[in-house]
Amino acid sequence: RLSWDDPDFQTRLTRSNSRCQGQLEVYIKYGWHMVCSQSWGRSSNQWEDPNQASKVCQRLNCGVPLSLGPFLITDRHQSQITCYGRLGSFSNCSHSGRDVCRPLGLTCLEPQTTTPPPTRPPPTTTPEPTAPPRLQLVAQAAGRHCAGVVEFYSGSLGGTISYEAQDKAQDKTQVLENFLCSSLQCGSFLKHLPETEAATAQDPGELREHQPLPIQWTIRNSSCTSLEHCFQKIKPRNSGQVLALLCSGFQPKVQSRLVGSSICEGTVEVRQGAQWAALCDSSSAKSSLRWEEVCREQQCGSFNSYQALDAGDPTSRGLSCPHQKLSQCHELTERKSYCKKVFVTCQDPNP
């Protein structure tokens, strides 16, 4: 049968800067097609048990599936198909009109990048290593991308970079951070991750395979334009503040949905990973920029109104984002009580 469980079935995830998440496209007959989220009798804003797509994630060399549901961006020029029958079956599909199709998105866990453990520093008689220097961002939680502790490798030597009080004092322009994010193909620099986020933030119960490397480097030239001139070797040590960055290309991004009687209005729910939860009202939520973005993600028209619902219940829990826009949120913070839900109305493009 023609299904995504067939070992020869070709899928790809597009419209994202991560190969393990994006809009699902499938190859059938003579070309690639975008799959509509209304396929297999689902409604366009319904979320599925992601485990049903585990074979897809596996074949893409990604980790376990985290989410399967509507994707935010559509390419109107692409072949779009709606399929029928059992979820993941492509035996019976029809081409869909441009206006009715909402793409299906899939997020798989990013595989942990494993780096061979660095060897001991060579004896002083050995000539300097000649392999090109390289950088790596080591995320503390599996599947994170473009956020974490910076590791610098030069030849056989690899380690983290010291980032102490004096570096912070001199570091006003953040030229180095932008250069590092850009060298890592992670966009531009957003913020420094505090030590707690960088060195200890782990998903509960998750053991990190990649143990932190010792500090081997310090910043030599913060306006460097090639990696070999940025850092200098120091005597290795195992404690101290290290350079940890969050770049604009971080993944996974926060996803939002509106839960209500129509696609374009309802209480806002968010997730970053597997679990949906209510978005709590906060001072940063006052900006219309946040809600414009939410409306856009639902593929609705412009933002109409937002209303914070009464949080009389001390047990009401949710997630909040300290930034103006949800797309800037690297980590949602959990609110265990008095979470004021938010009701947003967007313009319905098809009233």
Epitope: R1, Q10, Y27, I28, K29, Y30, N92
Partner: antibody, heavy 120, light 106 residues
Framework: QVTLKESGPGILKPSQTLSLTCSFS??????????VGWIRQPSGKGLEWLAH???????YYNPSLKNQLTISKDASRDQVFLKITNLDTADTATYYC????????????WGQGTTLTVSS | NIVMTQSHKFMSTSVGDRVSIACKAS??????VAWYQQKPGQSPKLLIY???TRHTGVPDRFTGSGSGTDFTLTITNVQSEDLADYFC????????FGSGTRLELK
């Protein structure tokens, strides 16, 4: 095991219509994802894809020959047919019947070919 | 129509050699490329599909590589039975074949 066998008239005159039949076994065109098509090869030259028909009756034609070609199937009899109208001497070639799955695994099985000569 | 160009009509090799047959697409075809072997008087046989996946029963001395517009079929440790015509095929948009490369003995 999968086999495909072509049959055709052998010799025709210019402007006539060619009718080819492909009889296959070892798979069914009622199975989703299955397709059968036609490819030709003039003697000592390259391969040219002509047409393809799928399990769901979806058909694809080579855009440069579309107006001359008609492909059809009888899934219950395990047969696929190709008609080429308004023949020309340039249509002299060996015609192959091929199987291809919708997952894009290439033309995985080929018939032995039937030779057509178009001559006045 | 996407044009597939096999720039070498003929390639000479010796038994035990390694040979690479090139194929270039006129536009990006992703990895939707297959390779076929055809011996005189026989039908073509599928060797490789999706650029690098070997068809059932194909010896592992045949490997495919590439993506986008440039593709290569490599035969390591060439055997006398490998002397044949080789065709590349794109199926990203309809189907088009390369004109073929004949592998012959030096």
């Amino acid at each position: 095991q999968v086999t495909l066998k072509e049959s055709g008239p052998g010799i025709l005159k210019p402007s006539q219509t060619l009718s080819l039949t492909c009889s296959f076994s070892g798979f069914s065109l009622s199975t989703s994802g299955m397709g059968v098509g036609w490819i030709r090869q003039p003697s000592g030259k390259g391969l040219e894809w002509l047409a393809h028909i799928w399990w769901d009756d979806d058909v694809y034609y080579n855009p440069s020959l579309k107006n001359q070609l008609t492909i059809s199937k009888d899934a219950s009899r395990d047969q696929v047919f190709l008609k080429i109208t308004n023949l020309d001497t340039a249509d002299t070639a060996t015609y192959y019947c091929v199987r291809r799955r919708a997952t894009g695994t290439g033309f995985d099985y080929w018939g032995q070919g039937t030779t057509l000569t178009v001559s006045s | 129509n996407i044009v597939m160009t096999q720039s070498h009509k003929f390639m000479s090799t010796s038994v035990g050699d390694r040979v690479s047959i090139a194929c270039k697409a006129s536009q990006d075809v992703g990895t939707a490329v297959a390779w076929y072997q055809q011996k005189p008087g026989q039908s073509p046989k599928l060797l490789i599909y999706w650029t690098s996946t070997r068809h059932t029963g194909v010896p592992d001395r045949f490997t495919g590589s590439g993506s986008g517009t440039d593709f290569t079929l490599t035969i390591t440790n060439v055997q006398s039975e490998d002397l044949a015509d080789y065709f590349c095929h794109q199926y990203n948009s309809y189907n088009t074949f390369g004109s073929g490369t004949r592998l012959e003995l030096k």
